[in-house]
Amino acid sequence: LQDPCSNCPAGTFCDNNRNQICSPCPPNSFSSAGGQRTCDICRQCKGVFRTRKECSSTSNAECDCTPGFHCLGAGCSMCEQDCKQGQELTKKGCKDCCFGTFNDQKRGICRPWTNCSLDGKSVLVNGTKERDVVCGPSPADLSPGASSVTPPAPAREPGHSPQ
């Protein structure tokens, strides 16, 4: 015998209290698949969360973060404070990247500048706290029309970089 509940479409639930009639999901609830015996409560985007997509009878609400914060976790389960480029978030708030590291994003950690010599290349542009070092082509890569690669003088001021 076919389960009568299997005929209940998304947006409804199989109401055991009403002889397994398909009843619409109550306000602020949803069912995203058919044959459900209950509807799920809609997610509410409160506080630092804001609504990106309203809840409907067939799909949950989706949240993102208010300006100054960014999403973390699956489905934006958390909001984390933004920092400026060239900074990272610590327990004491946003702190500038240390010399020799960079962060080109408003989230994440400061990372060491690229070590060009690992690829047998020279430094084409020095790093800053907002931007990574740029490595020049190795001598074998140079050809007419390409940029010359004279390593610049070492950076004298604290610097760091992006991404």
Partner: antibody
Amino acid sequence: EVQLLESGGGLVQPGGSLRLSCAASGFTFSGYDMSWVRQAPGKGLEWVSVIYPDDGNTYYADSVKGRFTISRDNSKNTLYLQMNSLRAEDTAVYYCAKHGGQKPTTKSSSAYGMDGWGQGTLVTVSS
Amino acid sequence: QSVLTQPPSASGTPGQRVTISCSGSSSNIGNNYVTWYQQLPGTAPKLLIYADSHRPSGVPDRFSGSKSGTSASLAISGLRSEDEADYYCATWDYSLSGYVFGGGTKLTVL
């Protein structure tokens, strides 16, 4: 020689879905950031999304956030763009682009630009 | 409207020097590297300048890039008919967490 070949474009109705693919060859695919960039007929270039190879991080333009999903299969040297809830304004030629700066040696590709491009695939959203 | 502002058109005669500007803000050009692309009619874009002022192998030294503050420029000297194309600036924008392109400049060689 870097080669990028997009496929999967076509005509789709508003609200519909499409999945674009980009087959890459001629370089170590797993070492580079990859982007999708689009160009509406007669208009300029618009960056759509990027995916990093090392941590799998993804970023999207506000115009497609929540509707498009970028992914990659390094074992198949292929980049994907899943496009849902398509709108008329998504009509464009979609280019697959390789960033310069091989990871993990290079920490950030943003300096090196997009140094390899496919020929593009046309997506038309119309009823 | 693009985050990066370019003049929609520019023109010059063969042999002339032409400059294309690209204006942004501290969240993009001001703290990040600028790249330039050339798009010939009916073709895919091609990287012309990376890291503000550096040319990839194979790009003629007639093309040069520069940056000052929140603006960047592409200069083309000894203009040739084959330089007729659309030119785009681009960079990373940390506040948007994404790449941004200028609106493009159509260069006509008269």
